[in-house]
Interface confidence: low
C-alpha cells in the first residue's frame, strides 16, 4: 500500500482488531452477536463462543435432543458442517463436558459480496454524490466502505501521487441511504471513487472514475410562473428562477430550455430562452397551457436537468389588437448584462412591450410608428457621432489603441471572451 494510504490502513487494522473479542475463541464478525456465517455447498465451521479454545464440547440443534457432534470428535470447540445447505441454517447450542452452556450460535448462509453497482451525479459544480446498490444478493448483512481520491499525477513518474490527492473517506448519508457526498470538488479534476461492499464472508470493490464536467446535471429551475398578457389572447409570459442548489457565481451560468403545449395536445413546442423569462406568442386562445423548463450548464457540461413541475396558464381573453409590422419588433431595449452577484437577471422580453400595441385606433398606431421612426433616426445619428469620436480618439493615442477606461462602463468585468450573453 502506498504511503498515502497509511492513514486509512491504520483505521482498517484498528477496526479489524476491535472485531476480534479477546474473551472468546471465536472471531466475531460484525453484525448481530452470536450469528456466524457460511456459504451454501461449502464446509462451515461453527465456533462455541463461551469456552476456551480447544475445549471439547457437545453440539445440539436448538429444540432437538439429538446430539450432532460429541466432545470426543477431536474438533474441540468447533462444529464442522460439510456441504452446508438451507436446512443447516438455524440456532445451535454448545455444552461443555460438565453440562454447562457454552453458548448459542445462529448459522446464516449466504455469499461473499459481488462488486456493487455505483453511479455518481452532481447538481452543481462544487459537490457530487455517489450512490450504490448490490449487484447480486448475498443474503447476509452488508455494509459499504466509501472513499475517493483526486486523480492528479506528479511529473513523469506515474506512481508518485501528491498527498493532497487522498484517499479521503466519502461521507455517507447519516440516514442510511446508499449515498455519499464529496464536498468542495474541483470542476476540472478527475476523481476515483472506491465503493467496497463488505459482508462477513468477504469484500468486493468497485472503482469508478468521474469528472464533474461529465456528471453535472443541475436541479430543475424553480418558481416557474405562467401569466397571461392582458389584451393578447395568444400570449403567455413564463418566468422562473435558478435552482436553489446552484451556487451564485457569475462564471458558472445556466442556460434554459422551455416547453409548452395546450391542454390535451400530445406534442410539446420547445424554445431556448436567453434568460429567466420567455413570452410565448403562439399560444392557443382560450386554452390552458402547460409549461415546463429545464436547465443546463451554459457551456454544455453534463446533461440537461429533469423538467420542472409543470405550471399552467391560460391566455387572457379579449380582442386581438392589430399587430404592428414585423420591423417594429426590432425596436426593443438592449439586453441587460448579468451583474456579479446575480447569475442571470430577468431580461426584458424580446417581444414588443404589450402597452405599445394596446392601440384604440389607427391614428394612434401611425403616431407611434412615426415616433419610432424619429427615435431610430436619432439613434443612427448618435451612433455615427460616437463612431467618429471613437475613431478620433483612437488615432490620437500614441500606440493606436483606445485610451484607458474608454468603454469601460459598458464592458462588464466578469464577461469572458466568447462567453454567451445570458
Amino acid at each position: 500500500m502506498s504511503s498515502s494510504c497509511s492513514g486509512l490502513s491504520r483505521v482498517l487494522v484498528a477496526v479489524a482488531t476491535a472485531l476480534v473479542s479477546a474473551s472468546s475463541p471465536c472471531p466475531q464478525a460484525w453484525g448481530p452477536p452470536g450469528v456466524q456465517y457460511g456459504q451454501p455447498g461449502r464446509s462451515v465451521k461453527l465456533c462455541c463462543p463461551g469456552v476456551t479454545a480447544g475445549d471439547p464440547v457437545s453440539w445440539f440443534r436448538d429444540g432437538e435432543p439429538k446430539l450432532l457432534q460429541g466432545p470426543d470428535s477431536g474438533l474441540g470447540h468447533e462444529l464442522v458442517l460439510a456441504q452446508a445447505d438451507s436446512t443447516d441454517e438455524g440456532t445451535y447450542i454448545c455444552q461443555t463436558l460438565d453440562g454447562a452452556l457454552g453458548g448459542t450460535v445462529t448459522l446464516q448462509l449466504g455469499y461473499p459480496p459481488a462488486r456493487p453497482v455505483v453511479s455518481c451525479q452532481a447538481a452543481d459544480y462544487e459537490n457530487f454524490s455517489c450512490t450504490w446498490s448490490p449487484s447480486q444478493i448475498s443474503g447476509l448483512p452488508t455494509r459499504y466502505l466509501t472513499s475517493y481520491r483526486k486523480k492528479t499525477v506528479l511529473g513523469a513518474d506515474s506512481q508518485r501521487r501528491s498527498p493532497s490527492t487522498g484517499p479521503w473517506p466519502c461521507p455517507q448519508d447519516p440516514l442510511g441511504a446508499a449515498r455519499c457526498v464529496v464536498h468542495g470538488a474541483e470542476f476540472w479534476s478527475q476523481y476515483r471513487i472506491n465503493v467496497t461492499e463488505v459482508n462477513p464472508l468477504g469484500a468486493s470493490t468497485r472503482l469508478l472514475d468521474v469528472s464533474l464536467q461529465s456528471i453535472l446535471r443541475p436541479d430543475p429551475p424553480q418558481g416557474l410562473r405562467v401569466e397571461s398578457v392582458p389584451g393578447y389572447p395568444r400570449r403567455l409570459r413564463a418566468s422562473w428562477t435558478y435552482p436553489a442548489s446552484w451556487p451564485c457565481q457569475p462564471h458558472f451560468l445556466l442556460k434554459f430550455r422551455l416547453q409548452y403545449r395546450p391542454a390535451q395536445h400530445p406534442a410539446w413546442s420547445t424554445v431556448e430562452p436567453a434568460g429567466l423569462e420567455e413570452v410565448i406568442t403562439d399560444a392557443v386562445a382560450g386554452l390552458p397551457h402547460a409549461v415546463r423548463v429545464s436547465a443546463r450548464d451554459f457551456l454544455d457540461a453534463g446533461t440537461w436537468s429533469t423538467w420542472s413541475p409543470e405550471a399552467w396558464g391560460t391566455p387572457s381573453t379579449g380582442t386581438i389588437p392589430k399587430e404592428i409590422p414585423a420591423w417594429g419588433q426590432l425596436h426593443t431595449q438592449p439586453e441587460v448584462e448579468p451583474q456579479v452577484d446575480s447569475p442571470a437577471p430577468p431580461r426584458p422580453s424580446l417581444q414588443p412591450h404589450p402597452r405599445l400595441l394596446d392601440h384604440r385606433d389607427s391614428v394612434e398606431q401611425v403616431a407611434v410608428l412615426a415616433s419610432l421612426g424619429i427615435l431610430s433616426f436619432l439613434g443612427l445619428v448618435a451612433g455615427a457621432l460616437a463612431l467618429g469620436l471613437w475613431l478620433r480618439l483612437r488615432r490620437g493615442g500614441k500606440d493606436g489603441s483606445p485610451k484607458p477606461g474608454f468603454l469601460a462602463s459598458v464592458i462588464p468585468v466578469d464577461r469572458r471572451p466568447g462567453a454567451p450573453n445570458l
Epitope: G41, T87, G90, S135, I137, G139
Partner: antibody
C-alpha cells in the same frame, strides 16, 4: 404441506398505513426467506423485498424502501408487511411467497399465499 | 434493474399442441457462484402464481414432465410438449440473480 395464509382484502384511506400478514405453516418458518410481491392488473409482478425470519435481515427493492417495512413474529410463524402513506398507486394484490432451496442458494418463490387485495379509496 | 422480455405476449394453442415461450434478460443471469437463477411460474385466473421450473431447467415437485426449461446467459425457453386444459393461464419468467428480483410481463396461453 406448506401453507401461507393471507387475509382476502383490506380497504384503507389515502395517506393511511396498512399492516398485511402472512401466516406460515407446514415447514420450519425460520429456515426460509419470505418474499413479498405486488401485482396490479395489467402491470405484472413486482418484487418488494424479502426477510430472513431467523435473523430479521431484510433486502428491499430500492423502489419500495420507503413504502414497505418487513417484519416477522417467530412465535406465531407470521410475516408482516407495513405499507405507509398509501395512494391509489398502492391499490394492488400483495402476495407473500416462501423462498426455496435445493442445497444451494437461490430465492425463487416455491410457495405463494393467495394474496391480499389492498384498495386505497376515500 | 434487469429487464425480462417475454415473447409472445399471447399464445393461442389447441389442446395437444406443443407450446414454446421465450424469455430474454437485459444482462447475464449467471450468478458469481455459477448458478443461473431463472425461473418460470404459471398463474391461473383467480389464483396466485405457482412455481413450475427453477434454475432454468429444474422441475418443481409435482410439476408434470411435459414442462421443460432450457437456455443460458440471457436467452431462455419454456416448452410444453402437449398442452392440456389445466395448463392455460399466464406464464411469467423471473430472475433472482440480481437485485432487485424482476419478472417478465407474462405470456397468456389460451385456446385458439
Amino acid at each position: 404441506q406448506v401453507q401461507l395464509q393471507q387475509p382476502g382484502a383490506e380497504l384503507v384511506k389515502p395517506g393511511a398505513s396498512v399492516r398485511l400478514s402472512c401466516k406460515a405453516s407446514g415447514y420450519t418458518f425460520t429456515s426460509y426467506w419470505m418474499h413479498w410481491v405486488k401485482q396490479r392488473p395489467g402491470q405484472g409482478l413486482e418484487w418488494i423485498g424479502m426477510i430472513h425470519p431467523n435473523s430479521g435481515y431484510t433486502n428491499y427493492n430500492e423502489k419500495f424502501k420507503i413504502k414497505a417495512t418487513l417484519t416477522v413474529d417467530k412465535s406465531s410463524s407470521t410475516a408482516h408487511m407495513q405499507l405507509s402513506s398509501l395512494t391509489s398507486e398502492d391499490s394492488a394484490v400483495y402476495h407473500c411467497a416462501r423462498g426455496g432451496y435445493d442445497g444451494s442458494y437461490g430465492p425463487w418463490f416455491a410457495y405463494w399465499g393467495q394474496g391480499t387485495l389492498v384498495t386505497v379509496s376515500a | 434493474d434487469v429487464v425480462m422480455t417475454q415473447t409472445p405476449l399471447s399464445l393461442p394453442v389447441s389442446l395437444g399442441d406443443q407450446a414454446s415461450i421465450s424469455c430474454r434478460s437485459s444482462q447475464s443471469l449467471v450468478h458469481s457462484n455459477g448458478n443461473t437463477y431463472l425461473h418460470w411460474y404459471l398463474q391461473k385466473p383467480g389464483q396466485s402464481p405457482k412455481l413450475l421450473i427453477y434454475k432454468v431447467s429444474n422441475r418443481f415437485s409435482g410439476v408434470p414432465d411435459r414442462f421443460s426449461g432450457s437456455g443460458s446467459g440471457t436467452d431462455f425457453t419454456l416448452k410444453i410438449s402437449r398442452v392440456e386444459a389445466e395448463d392455460l393461464g399466464v406464464y411469467f419468467c423471473s430472475q433472482s440473480t440480481h437485485v432487485p428480483l424482476t419478472f417478465g410481463a407474462g405470456t397468456k396461453l389460451e385456446l385458439k
